[in-house]
């Protein structure tokens, strides 16, 4: 029951996280104009990964896409790539995890298969969350660098010219959405990985009798059958044959057809 709850909660948390990553990627407020000490109040500018928007004092708002690829900073392209990779991995992870959910029955899918799928989706969610966090952090670092460069330019002047009045940009709402969403996706992925361990059926010992006919002496031994999940070392249901009184965890040998009476 706890495993099902952990898996279900991991799925829901990851779903919210990935929805947040998609929302952040599409948002226009990745950077917003810093209003402090800015003499220009007629316009307020905010920018996203895909377009720039201006809200004017008249209330009129206009947005324009960045129609050039070559003119954009490599860092912006890297952030775009990280966010898209995060979304794609998260979407695939969601798809896989739906089929892996313990509460959903699909054909005669074994628990071992569900456990594998849960682990796969969990890893995908973790990588997706890390991509989003990395993307947002790279963008934030770019803003901080740009902010201090602009501040320096304001007071020292650019290229020997007189003081430059340059618009500075600060963190927009999308950065916080991205960080939280990436964190949720990461947590959801960890929960899925934890759930995977509980989904893997434990090896169960069945009491049985096996015997090994070696010459004239016959030795009987209890606990001869071992059921396996496919996750342990004993990957096939093997009969354990023994000539002496050894424990079943010791070296095992495959039976031959002559061992059966």
């Amino acid at each position: 029951m706890a495993v099902t709850a952990c898996q279900g909660l991991g799925f829901v948390v990851s779903l919210i996280g990935i929805a947040g990553i998609i929302a952040a990627t599409c948002m226009d407020q990745w950077s917003t104009q810093d209003l402090y000490n800015n003499p220009v109040t007629a316009v307020f500018n905010y920018q996203g990964l895909w377009r720039s928007c201006v809200r004017e004092s008249s209330g009129f708002t206009e947005c324009r896409g960045y129609f050039t690829l070559l003119g954009l900073p490599a860092m912006l392209q890297a952030v775009r790539a990280l966010m898209i990779v995060g979304i794609v991995l998260g979407a695939i992870g969601l798809l896989v995890s739906i089929f892996a959910l313990k509460c959903i029955r699909i054909g005669s899918m074994e628990d071992s298969a569900k456990a594998n799928m849960t682990l796969t989706s969990g890893i995908m969610f973790i990588v997706s969350g890390l991509c989003a966090i990395a993307g947002v952090s790279v963008f934030a670092n770019m803003l901080v660098t740009n902010f201090w460069m602009s501040t320096a330019n304001m007071y020292t002047g650019m290229g020997g010219m007189v003081q430059t009045v340059q618009t500075r940009y600060t963190f927009g709402a999308a950065l916080f959405v991205g960080w939280v969403a990436g964190g949720l996706t990461l947590i959801g992925g960890v929960m899925m990985c934890i759930a995977c361990r509980g989904l893997a059926p434990e090896e169960t010992n069945y009491k049985a009798v096996s015997y090994h006919a070696s010459g004239h002496s016959v030795a009987y031994k209890p606990g001869g059958f071992k059921a396996s999940t496919g996750f342990g070392s004993n990957t096939k249901n093997k009969k354990i044959y023994d000539g002496g009184a050894r424990t079943e965890d010791e070296v095992q040998s495959y039976p031959s057809k002559h061992d059966y009476v």
């Epitope: 950077s31 220009v40 007629a42 316009v43 500018n45 920018q47 720039s52 928007c53 201006v54 004017e56 004092s57 008249s58 009129f60 206009e62 947005c63 324009r64 960045y66 003119g71 954009l72 900073p73 912006l76 803003l143 740009n146 430059t164 009045v165 340059q166 618009t167 940009y169």
Partner: nanobody, 118 residues
Framework: QVQLVESGGGLVQPGGSLRLSCAAS????????MGWWRQAPGSQRELVAI???????QYGDSVKGRFTISRDNAKNTVYLQMASLKPEDTAVYYC????????????WGQGTQVTVSL
């Protein structure tokens, strides 16, 4: 790259008028403002007036009611009509285009001298 060419500066008597113009050539990102800033010797650069691509206008406190800014989007040109000039309006007037492409860009003209004196 954007080049700005200013014209119209000169010597004028107090109470007189002058018209500055600034033509921008090159590729300018669609969202922007064009405007005028001035810098008197020993002081910081201050806002005179700006006209945005969307039609909004803003004036600096010291020139409100005396100066008028206009903009021709088709020609990428901005004009500053200065009236009732005072000696304190003496400064180098700089044309500025600020584009709102990614993280913004500022382009500046070389400046034109305006001297208000008897």
């Amino acid at each position: 790259q954007v080049q700005l060419v200013e014209s119209g500066g000169g010597l004028v008597q107090p109470g007189g008028s002058l018209r500055l113009s600034c033509a921008a050539s090159g590729s300018i990102f669609g969202l922007n403002f064009m405007g005028w800033w001035r810098q008197a010797p020993g002081s910081q650069r201050e806002l005179v007036a700006i006209a945005t691509s969307g039609g909004s206008i803003q004036y600096g406190d010291s020139v409100k009611g005396r100066f008028t800014i206009s903009r021709d989007n088709a020609k990428n040109t901005v004009y500053l009509q200065m009236a009732s000039l005072k000696p304190e309006d003496t400064a180098v007037y700089y044309c500025n285009v600020h584009t709102y492409d990614f993280l913004g860009r500022d382009y500046w003209g070389q400046g034109t001298q305006v001297t208000v004196s008897l």
